[in-house]
């Protein structure tokens, strides 16, 4: 009689992550007796997958009944693969022997493949925030792939970016992947609504790419621009001074009137206009009482924008002169204004 | 449900022999080994040995090796484990437990008293 | 034979606390085939970790193994009252079985 064989059809198996795997193995003799055990890898540590007689098992079901007499049907199927699974599966006959059972004959081995998809793309951007014209980076990292191939692009606005690197880990054989990738962006004024995407496209994910955002709103500091105006009020006595606060972001604002360097009031923006672009205006005003001043009034507006070094802007006051014919007037903008006489 | 319902306590004297019962059901009786583990009181764990209830064959702890008999009747799906030229030391709870190490009996506890 | 020597044999500790149980074999076992158990008074043990470090169906997962060679390690981050018991590691590598000792876990 011929010598047993033991014969795995399938030389490679791919599976997606979560499904099972059949692995066929069937011998060719009912002779020796002696069970069949399934392992993964070889050598002295490989690891028991499957022993039909002994052992826990909760992931392992037999193909076919293996305590009918004359079954030469040894395969099985392994539930909920992971990546973890992948590597090259043996089913192994073995003769009864004493005091342990003596390893017969191998099959020549199936390897199993895992496709696993890449997780989310999670996007991060610096810690601090910065100013336009800066260049900051953004990280992109996604976990848990297989195979290794993927592809990583950058996009601001729906436009590609140019300036990333991507690497993946680990460089050699792995059961599962992770990519990592930084990219470098040149901040703008109107970046205020714009968005960094990363996208990720893996053989798993059937031509729909995953994709991270990243808002620039979290990333950039719009400084504000000042202007202080001198209006003409009804009174012969009063003048109205006014700062305009513009285009900056994010919101958070606090503004201090000085009357020749002492502080005069302060406040914390809160009724603020917003710009096609994002960005904010906010306009401040003091009515002064001319008659209250002998001479000349130097007015600063100084504004400390989102716990930056506070900017200003100037305004002298000549009480000498004819309150109407000073400044011009841009009343327009004046909506949740503020009010404040000095005597 | 897997279950393995064992035989009651006995009361032996030294030098007899004590045959326990382990009735399964809930599974393939063919399927997996029958093992026999012992526990002296305030002990730990000793393996006797099993039996694969599809052919017959059994191993041993030579430890018991000579003294220890397990066999199985397939058709009402029970194992069996006698144990000959009992001493005081013997005195125990026997556990059948199903191959995959999950399924454990309830114990039978075998008194050696003269 | 393979020998199983665990350790502590005693390891009193209180509700919250991390207890790190010991095996170790006189000779090398395949992770695949050491198991864990715990048993509390008048019952038979129960199958806590199988293949070394994988968690048995229903078993908390506060409770951990690990190890290769010859040295494992049961952990249980924080114990829980009902986890005071005694734990055996087993090995059914090879003829004939054994299990360990075991250790008690007491409250302190």
């Known amino acids: 009689e011929e010598e047993l064989q033991v014969i795995q059809p399938d030389k490679s198996v791919l599976v997606a992550a979560g499904e099972t795997a059949t692995l066929r193995c069937t011998a060719t003799s009912l002779i020796p007796v002696g069970p069949i055990q399934w392992f993964r890898g070889a050598g002295p540590g490989r690891e028991l997958i499957y022993n039909q007689k002994e052992g826990h098992f909760p992931r392992v079901t037999t193909v076919s009944d293996l305590t009918k007499r004359n079954n030469m049907d040894f395969s099985i199927r392994i539930g909920n693969i992971t990546p973890a699974d992948a590597g090259t599966y043996y089913c192994v006959k073995f003769r009864k022997g004493s005091p342990d059972d003596v390893e017969f004959k191998s099959g020549a081995g199936t390897e199993l493949s895992v496709r696993a998809k890449p997780s989310a793309p999670v996007v991060s951007g610096p810690a601090a925030r910065a100013t336009p014209q800066h260049t900051v980076s953004f990280t992109c990292e996604s976990h848990g792939f297989s195979p290794r191939d993927i592809t990583l692009k950058w996009f601001k606005n729906g436009n590609e970016l140019s300036d990333f690197q991507t690497n993946v880990d680990p460089v050699g054989e792995s059961v599962s992947y992770s990519i990592h990738s930084t990219a470098k962006v040149v901040l703008t004024r109107e970046d205020v609504h714009s968005q960094v995407i990363c996208e990720v496209a893996h053989v798993t994910l059937q031509g729909d790419p995953l994709r991270g955002t990243a808002n620039l709103s979290e990333t950039i500091r719009v400084p504000p621009t000042l202007e202080v105006t001198q209006q003409p009020v009804r009174a012969e006595n009063q003048v109205n001074v006014t700062c305009q606060v513009r285009k900056f972001y994010p919101q958070r604002l606090q503004l201090t009137w000085l009357e020749n360097g002492n502080v005069s009031r302060t406040e914390t923006a809160s009724t603020v206009t917003e710009n096609k672009d994002g960005t904010y205006n906010w306009m401040s005003w003091l009515l002064v009482n001319v008659s209250a001043h002998r001479d000349d009034v130097k007015l600063t507006c100084q504004v400390e924008h989102d716990g930056q070094p506070a900017v200003s802007k100037s305004h002298d006051l000549k009480v000498s002169a004819h309150p109407k014919e000073q400044g011009s007037n841009t009343a327009a903008e004046n909506t949740g204004s503020n009010e404040r006489n000095i005597y | 449900e897997v279950q393995l319902v064992q035989s009651g306590a006995e009361v032996k004297k030294p030098g007899a022999t004590v045959k326990i019962s382990c009735k399964a059901s809930?599974?393939?009786?063919?399927?997996?080994?029958i093992h026999w583990v012992q526990q002296a009181p305030g002990k730990g764990l000793e393996w006797m040995g099993r039996i694969d209830p599809a052919d017959g064959d059994t191993k041993h702890n030579p430890k018991f090796h000579d003294r220890v008999t397990i066999t199985v009747d397939t058709s009402t799906n029970t194992a069996y484990m006698e144990l000959s030229s009992l001493r005081s030391e013997d005195t125990a709870v026997y556990y059948c437990?199903?191959?995959?190490?999950?399924?454990w009996g309830q114990g039978t506890t075998v008194t050696v008293s003269s | 034979e393979i020998v199983l020597t665990q350790s502590p044999a005693t390891l009193s500790l209180s509700p919250g606390e991390r207890a790190t149980l010991s095996c170790r074999a006189s000779?090398?076992?395949?992770?695949?085939?050491l198991y864990w158990y715990q048993q509390k008074p008048g019952q038979a043990p129960r199958l806590l970790i199988y293949?070394?470090?994988n968690l048995a169906s229903g078993i908390p997962a506060r409770f951990s193994g690990s190890g290769s060679g010859t040295d494992f390690t049961l952990t249980i981050s924080s114990l829980e009252p009902e986890d005071f018991a005694v734990y055996y590691c087993h090995q059914w590598y090879s003829y004939p079985r054994t299990f360990g000792g075991g250790t008690k876990v007491e409250i302190k």
């Open positions: 000779s090398s076992v395949t992770s695949s085939y």
């Open positions: 293949s070394a470090s």
């Open positions: 809930g599974f393939n009786f063919e399927d997996t080994y």
């Open positions: 437990v199903r191959g995959n190490y999950v399924n």
